[in-house]
């Protein structure tokens, strides 16, 4: 028998520094978690003690904090190199700055293989990107070899900016021939490492012949055997065992997100490369694990540029940006309009001639807008200003909802109107009319939404049975502010970009902004 220890991370999303327990900014260091310095301590401890250790990342290192905004992926390459990762799969967010924003800072600088079998380059890009990422890599581990085959969500063109010269194929269809190729090379221990979400991870385990282990990401899935050590509730046991179509027991793992845990999976193989046993658990990277001093010193060195950046001007406003709770929790506010416009702009993807865009709608809880920005400071807007408006370090995500769910959400928006509660929705690509004289649950009298399958966007009445794409804060996607119907009824959920980053990018792009209150949200009384 031969033992392999797989250490894995996924969806780290730019959390290079330690964070609070909820993965936001670290406030009380004695209770903080994660970060690359702490991760390195744990990884090195395991490497020193155990044989045959692989450190793998299942994608989405990019995007999530000011680290990515400023360093644009150079920080990922630098610190992943320092931690001596053995391989990484491409996630959808690795394409957020376009293909160039992946090639230059990461693909060219990484000292470890970066993998995806289902991304195929075409046209002029094919030669430019050739060899910079691979479908698979055979890694020597001790006296044996292990094949790692990568995959990436085929939804990436809708979630990021991969451009027109990358084709995202079906994961299973693309993986099988690569696994077959590894088998012909006498590689009999094969790990599928990828970023398509837990449901696809399980399908790969079931359908792709020859895959021994699946290490996934994208869905931020927390698996655990026994009593979980923090707030995350397990979606199943670690590892999650899938019985493949050819009768093998295939372990599937994921390690939540944000570098809070280090996945730890111990696999025992027989001499023919069959998995005899698998066990382990994610390791909570809490403050009992010290931060490695040399990595921490490096983090502090890189940190200096971030502090400078946060006070630099991103753009100007020539109007007062009303982010006050007195406005945003009671009526349409222009800060809400600005943020929603930025959210839609960040999701412009012309992937189909029939659609001007794949998504046109935004909703945003007014309680998530925490500060106004005064234009009388020479109109200057800085990252620091935006951090006061959006202090929670959330993301703006893409969901698919039925019209009926949206209607319920808008009813919830005003079900206790007048109490300055956070659930009042700011919008984009939506015209809503409320009649507050009606009883709660029946106050939405008009709900029109901007078409997507049209050359000239216009507002049409919401259809209850139609499925719509909507951009919203992850807080709402997770049922926050009482929006349980969104969490319970959403048909798809893909995590998006850091909230501040979305707005800052938009302001930088527009240079001068002047959002207005323009009748997106109206109130009527009596018959409509």
């Amino acid at each position: 028998a031969w033992e392999l220890t797989i250490l894995h991370t996924n969806d780290v999303h730019s959390r290079l520094e330690q964070t609070s327990e909820d993965s936001s900014k670290c406030v009380n260091a004695s209770r903080c978690m994660g970060g690359v310095a702490r991760l390195f301590t744990k990884v090195q401890q395991i490497r020193r003690a155990e044989p045959n250790v692989l450190l793998l990342d299942a994608g989405d290192q990019y995007q999530g904090t000011i680290w990515f905004t400023v360093y644009k992926g150079a920080e990922v390459a630098h610190f992943m190199n320092a931690l001596r990762y053995d391989a990484m799969a491409l996630g959808n967010h690795e394409f957020d700055n376009g293909v160039e924003g992946l090639i230059e800072p990461l693909l060219k600088e990484a000292k470890f293989p970066i993998l995806s079998a289902n991304i195929k380059a075409k046209g002029p890009l094919a030669s430019q990107i050739s060899g910079l990422y691979l479908p698979y890599k055979v890694l020597p581990v001790g006296d044996e070899v292990v094949g790692i085959v990568g995959y990436t969500s085929k939804e990436t063109p809708f979630l990021s900016n991969p451009g027109t010269n990358l084709v995202f194929e079906d994961e299973i269809t693309a993986l099988q021939p690569e696994v077959d190729k590894l088998k012909t090379l006498n590689v009999n221990k094969i790990i599928a490492l990828g970023h398509s979400g837990f449901e696809m991870d399980k399908l790969i385990a079931q359908k792709v012949r020859g895959v021994d282990v699946v290490v996934g990401g994208h869905s931020n899935t927390f698996l655990y055997t026994g009593n979980p050590p923090s707030k995350e509730v397990p979606a199943g046991k670690y590892p999650f065992i899938v019985t493949s179509d050819d009768g093998r027991k295939v372990p599937v793992v994921q390690a939540y997100a944000f570098g809070k845990y280090l996945g730890y999976l111990k696999i025992e193989f027989d001499e023919r490369g069959n998995v005899i046993s698998s066990h382990g658990n994610p390791i909570l990277l809490n403050s009992s694990i010290p931060e490695d001093p040399s990595i921490k010193a490096d983090i502090n060195k890189w940190r200096i540029k971030l502090d400078n950046y946060s006070t630099q001007e991103l753009g100007k406003t020539i109007v007062y940006l009303d982010g006050s709770s007195q406005s945003c929790r009671f009526r349409e506010c222009n800060m809400g309009n600005l943020i929603c416009d930025a959210m839609i702009n960040n999701n412009l993807r012309h992937t189909d001639e029939m659609f001007w865009n794949h998504v046109s709608m935004c909703i945003l809880n007014g309680g998530g807008i925490r500060s106004p920005i005064d234009e009388r400071n020479n109109g200057t807007i800085t990252w620091e200003n935006l951090a006061a408006v959006l202090p929670f370090g959330g993301t703006f995500d893409l969901v698919q909802l039925k019209g009926s769910t949206l209607k319920k959400a808008f009813e919830h928006s005003v079900h206790r109107y007048g109490q300055s509660t956070g659930e009042f929705l700011q919008v984009g690509g939506i015209h809503v009319v409320y009649d507050l004289s009606r009883k709660p649950g029946d106050r939405v009298v008009k709900l029109d939404v901007l078409c997507t399958k049209c050359r000239v966007p216009s507002y049409d009445p919401l259809k209850m049975d139609e499925v719509y794409k909507v951009i919203l804060p992850n807080f709402l996607a997770n049922g926050g502010d009482g929006f349980q119907m969104i969490k319970d009824e959403l048909l798809r959920h893909d995590s998006g970009d850091q909230d501040i980053n979305v707005v800052s990018t938009y302001i930088s792009k527009m240079k001068v902004i002047y959002p207005a209150v323009e009748g997106r949200i109206k109130f009527s009384t009596g018959s409509h």
Epitope: T41, Q45, R48, A49, N52, Y264, S288, I289, D292
Partner: antibody
Framework: EVQLQQSGPELVKPGASVKMSCKAS????????LHWVKQSHGKSLEWIGY????????GYNQKFKGKASLTVDKSSSTAYMELRSLTSEDSAVYYC???????????WGQGTSVTVSS | LLVLTQSPAIMSASPGEKVTMTCSAS?????MNWFQQRPGTSPKRWIS???KLASGVPARFSGSGSGTSYSLTISSMEAEDAATYYC?????????FGGGTKLEIK
């Protein structure tokens, strides 16, 4: 400062088994890997295996598989090594040694002397 | 099994003399650790990761090397340095120790 206190010397007959202990104090016992090392009289050191008290995961030098068995009792912060089917070749001093967060075998017990004699 | 061969097996040095002992690996490794053991006591971590001195180790000690060849050097021998020194690798499983170099004071 981490301290590892090992059990006293053992005189055992050939074919018998022996179980020695290594009690940790001064650290979070479960957080550090613990190793066992053999030193025959006047000879060098031989690594036997490791155990990670947190999970009970262990690994062995192939040479000692079947000879040594490593276990832990988290409640008493104590690691154990049992040696089976003893022969004169097993007469030696056996050390437990703990990794720290940053270094291999940073802390050592005082050793347990095992003498196999009829 | 990766074999570590230490040389010389036994050596003696006068106080103030420079001392170098070597450890040769049967195949290339990433790092070397060194332990000091005085008679009747447990080994002590002396040098980690090829060149990092353990806390309390005098600055006259140094470690260097790469690939298959590593060494421990004492710039100026002192009486308290008399001991046996073992090299130890964790690059290839199972972890192994060298046969030791016994350093005596003249």
């Amino acid at each position: 400062e981490v301290q590892l206190q090992q059990s006293g010397p053992e005189l055992v007959k050939p074919g018998a088994s022996v179980k020695m202990s290594c009690k940790a104090s001064g650290n979070i016992f479960t957080d550090y890997y613990l190793h066992w090392v053999k030193q025959s009289h006047g000879k060098s050191l031989e690594w036997i295996g490791y155990i990670y008290p947190n999970t009970g995961v262990n690994g062995y030098n192939q040479k000692f598989k079947g000879k040594a068995s490593l276990t832990v009792d988290k409640s008493s912060s104590t690691a154990y090594m049992e040696l089976r089917s003893l022969t004169s070749e097993d007469s030696a001093v056996y050390y437990c040694a703990s990794d720290s967060w940053f270094f291999a075998m940073d802390y050592w017990g005082q050793g347990t002397s095992v003498t196999v004699s009829s | 099994l990766l074999v570590l061969t230490q040389s010389p097996a036994i050596m003696s040095a006068s106080p103030g003399e420079k001392v170098t002992m070597t450890c040769s690996a049967s195949s290339s490794i990433n790092d070397m650790n060194w332990f000091q053991q005085r008679p009747g006591t447990s080994p002590k971590r002396w040098i980690s990761d090829t060149s990092k001195l353990a806390s309390g180790v005098p600055a006259r000690f140094s470690g260097s090397g790469s690939g298959t060849s590593y060494s421990l050097t004492i710039s100026s021998m002192e009486a308290e340095d008399a001991a046996t020194y073992y090299c130890h690798q964790r690059s290839s499983y199972p972890w192994t120790f060298g046969g030791g170099t016994k350093l005596e004071i003249k």
